[in-house]
Amino acid sequence: KNAVPPVIHSPNDHVVYEKEPGEELLIPCTVYFSFLMDSRNEVWWTIDGKKPDDITIDVTINESISHSRTEDETRTQILSIKKVTSEDLKRSYVCHARSAKGEVAKAAKVKQKVPAPRYTVELACGFGATGGGSGKPIPNPLLGLDSTGLNDIFEAQKIEWHEHHHHHH
């Protein structure tokens, strides 16, 4: 039987969870486990390296499990913070999975959404002109430059366990 270590499909490097403070943050962890007799499959989250139970954030985790007809298993744990704060958006959210074949972990890419900017340009006659909230950069005619949004406030670290690091036979 071709049993393999757990495979974390989500979170991954291709999907970013971008939220404004006050919004709900939902991060799914979905893990594929190949069938292995008597293996105890586990999935868990850490936030800044700690289990959610050990921190003061109001976080809930909901789990669902589905099986294929060959008894492979997919476990999904959705981490939810109802009203996320700017501090929460700077934390490290890592999904972990373990079976008898090995352990893997993957960080979610979480960042704070920059609100639609409003720029004020001083006109030569002393009046102010305020840019709209389209979220697009508004050229500043005095500087001849585009005013751009802030850099990413936070990009979660990436944790990958390649097979050449971690062999389980």
Epitope: H9, N12, T30, T76
Partner: antibody
Framework: EVQLVESGGGLVKPGGSLKLSCTAS????????MSWVRQTPEKRLEWVAT????????YYPDNVKGRFTISRDIAKNNLYLQMSHLKSEDTAMYYC???????????WGQGTTLTVSS | DIQMTQSPASLSVSVGETVTITCRAS??????LAWYQEKQGKSPQLLVY???NLADGVPSRFSGSGSGTQYSLKINSLQSEDFGSYYC?????????FGGGTKLELK
């Protein structure tokens, strides 16, 4: 330039066997998972098999599990698909693809055709 | 398993038009979606991944959007080289599966 060249397709009777090959060039073969994806005569795409970068782990959907075996020869930059107990529904164009496992396929070969018919 | 439903199955359009192709997942796939283009006689090519990210070398007239179960691929000002078939694919879990495809034909 990434290149993937498949070979080995042909006409096989139901219940028969066939081995497909793919030769890779233009990238470090041992750094990537590789997959076979097929396109049915109705133009549907189906994932068939994946092998991990070092070749230790293989993955299959339920409909080919136990009948198909994916393997690779890292020294030769070759990928293989051994198919047995073939059925008419395995008739398809078989593509070799570089795989950003477990996500998407970023480069595909030109394909080789398998026809399963009596 | 997740099923992907693409619409429309085919579309007759003219050069210069704007086209939107949609893909619906049978369950929430949280933006774990890719789009591919297949031109006549050629193999599929990656266009978009993570629902919105353009693959290297893909022209900016292509854009991906969506969330949850509903996703779309938009092509602004269609060029003659854009005709062909387009497929979505989820990577939310194993098995990864594809939509049935959308064929863009010249009107």
């Amino acid at each position: 330039e990434v290149q993937l060249v498949e070979s080995g397709g042909g006409l096989v009777k139901p219940g028969g066997s066939l081995k497909l090959s793919c030769t890779a060039s233009g990238f470090t073969f041992s750094n990537y998972a590789m997959s076979w994806v097929r396109q049915t005569p109705e133009k549907r795409l189906e994932w068939v098999a994946t092998i991990s970068d070092g070749g230790n782990y293989t993955y299959y959907p339920d409909n080919v599990k136990g009948r198909f075996t994916i393997s690779r020869d890292i020294a030769k930059n070759n990928l293989y698909l051994q198919m047995s107990h073939l059925k008419s529904e395995d008739t398809a164009m078989y593509y070799c693809a570089r795989d950003r496992w477990p996500y998407f396929f970023d480069f595909w070969g030109q394909g080789t055709t398998l026809t399963v018919s009596s | 398993d997740i099923q992907m439903t693409q619409s429309p199955a085919s579309l007759s359009v003219s050069v210069g038009e704007t086209v939107t192709i949609t893909c619906r997942a049978s369950d929430n796939i949280y933006s774990n979606l890719a789009w591919y283009q297949e031109k006549q006689g050629k193999s599929p090519q990656l266009l978009v991944y993570g629902a919105t990210n353009l693959a290297d070398g893909v022209p900016s007239r292509f854009s991906g959007s969506g969330s949850g179960t509903q996703y779309s691929l938009k092509i602004n000002s269609l060029q003659s080289e854009d005709f062909g078939s387009y497929y979505c694919q989820h990577f939310w879990t194993t098995p990864r599966s594809f939509g049935g495809g959308t064929k863009l034909e010249l009107k």
